[in-house]
Amino acid sequence: ILGGREAEAHARPYMASVQLNGAHLCGGVLVAEQWVLSAAHCLEDAADGKVQVLLGAHSLSQPEPSKRLYDVLRAVPHPDSQPDTIDHDLLLLQLSEKATLGPAVRPLPWQRVDRDVAPGTLCDVAGWGIVNHAGRRPDSLQHVLLPVLDRATCNRRTHHDGAITERLMCAESNRRDSCKGDSGGPLVCGGVLEGVVTSGSRVCGNRKKPGIYTRVASYAAWIDSVLA
């Protein structure tokens, strides 16, 4: 997270760290007792590694009573996700067992009504991604509030030049932005999950290259079918 600040510890009990061989790889969001939603591209290079999900964490390194690392029983990328596009960049991870819920571990309601979030709406994005352009990784969860950007502006040639489909949304990126390592994390508007940070190699913090988020409402049928 660029231009953000340390989150209040455990105030986002839905927040997950998707880990590869014991190290933070991507963000994720607990959407059901046994399911974490993240980004499909996160697992592209994870073929031989051990993927796990950390829940109940604020610090990645320090012991915390609520922290628990779960093995992954099943990883379900969206069937239409492809390495070279930002489209359909969703991944559902089934935990080896139901998460132990409590004040620091709780699923987040996700948006089912397929309607665009109004431009200018302030949404919260959180993650353990890099916090500066030098690539410094934080130990504790960071967050930032970002205004939603209308899709037409996001599709301008000087922004994302037509790449933003109706299944994607954008948020402003003027110094405050999601960045590398935040992919798969939640964009939360009014207490509801609206978007998932896409995992392209986008430049961060440049206002002309807004953050791109997969709209979960557009994938409600797929999410329901996997969770069923």
Partner: antibody, heavy 116, light 112 residues
């Protein structure tokens, strides 16, 4: 399939007004800026300006700002170009073109002739 | 406003010829985001323009590989490696980096 269809062109007297329409189909109208470009007979392309279909924000080439106005009817997925105080030198084919990717999608153009 | 000057204004060539059109801008067209929004369009009589090249050197989908773009700063080039009968048209460069966006005056490619 993305389609842009202009209409409303024709013969108009100097000092008169005309409203051109650009009806869009095959995509979500509010997802892309609409631009207007004109081309005088035998001449090059000239950018008139653009409009954001979500916010209604506009940007005009300074040469057209006083006399030309953009508007929208999002329920009809249509953009409009209102032209006032027309002059002979406004005689041209007028195009609408969607921005994103680049100007990949254009209407067929509508001819406006300003003559007495 | 940024002016784009194309040269030549017109040229005569034969099928199979290599054709080069240049476009010079009155100032740099590198955008504040670091990208250069220099595009090339092809237009045939009575038709709307067609996008060929975007961001200096990227071919738009469906554009034949004989079309290529290059350049940087203020000097840009469109090259047609082997002219085909359907390539006889007028070509325009365009800059989208700075408002007002502007077109070059055009280069008409005619049959020799």
């Amino acid at each position: 399939e993305v389609q842009l269809v202009e209409s409303g062109g024709g013969l108009v007297q100097p000092g008169g007004s005309l409203r051109l329409s650009c009806a869009a189909s095959g995509y979500q109208f509010t997802s892309y800026y609409m631009n207007w470009v004109r081309q005088a007979p035998g001449k090059g392309l000239e950018w008139i300006g653009d409009i954001n279909p979500v916010t209604g924000d506009t940007d005009y080439n300074a040469d057209f700002k006083r006399r030309f106005t953009f508007s929208l009817d999002t329920s009809k997925s249509t953009a409009y170009l209102q032209m006032n105080s027309l002059r002979a030198e406004d005689t041209a084919v007028y195009y609408c073109t969607r921005e994103g990717p680049s100007f990949a999608y254009w209407g067929q153009g509508t001819l406006v002739t300003v003559s007495s | 406003d940024i002016q784009l000057t194309q040269s030549p204004s017109s040229l005569s060539a034969s099928v199979g010829d290599r054709v080069t059109i240049t476009c010079r801008s009155s100032q740099t067209i590198v955008h504040s985001n670091g990208d250069t929004y220099l595009e090339w369009y092809q237009q045939k009589p009575g038709k709307a323009p067609n996008l060929l090249i975007y961001k200096v050197s990227n071919r738009f989908s469906g554009v034949p590989s004989r079309f290529s773009g290059s350049g940087s700063g203020t000097d840009f080039t469109l090259t047609i490696s082997s002219l085909q009968p359907e390539d006889f048209a007028t070509y325009y460069c365009f800059q989208g980096s700075h408002v007002p966006v502007t077109f070059g005056q055009g280069t008409k490619v005619e049959i020799k």
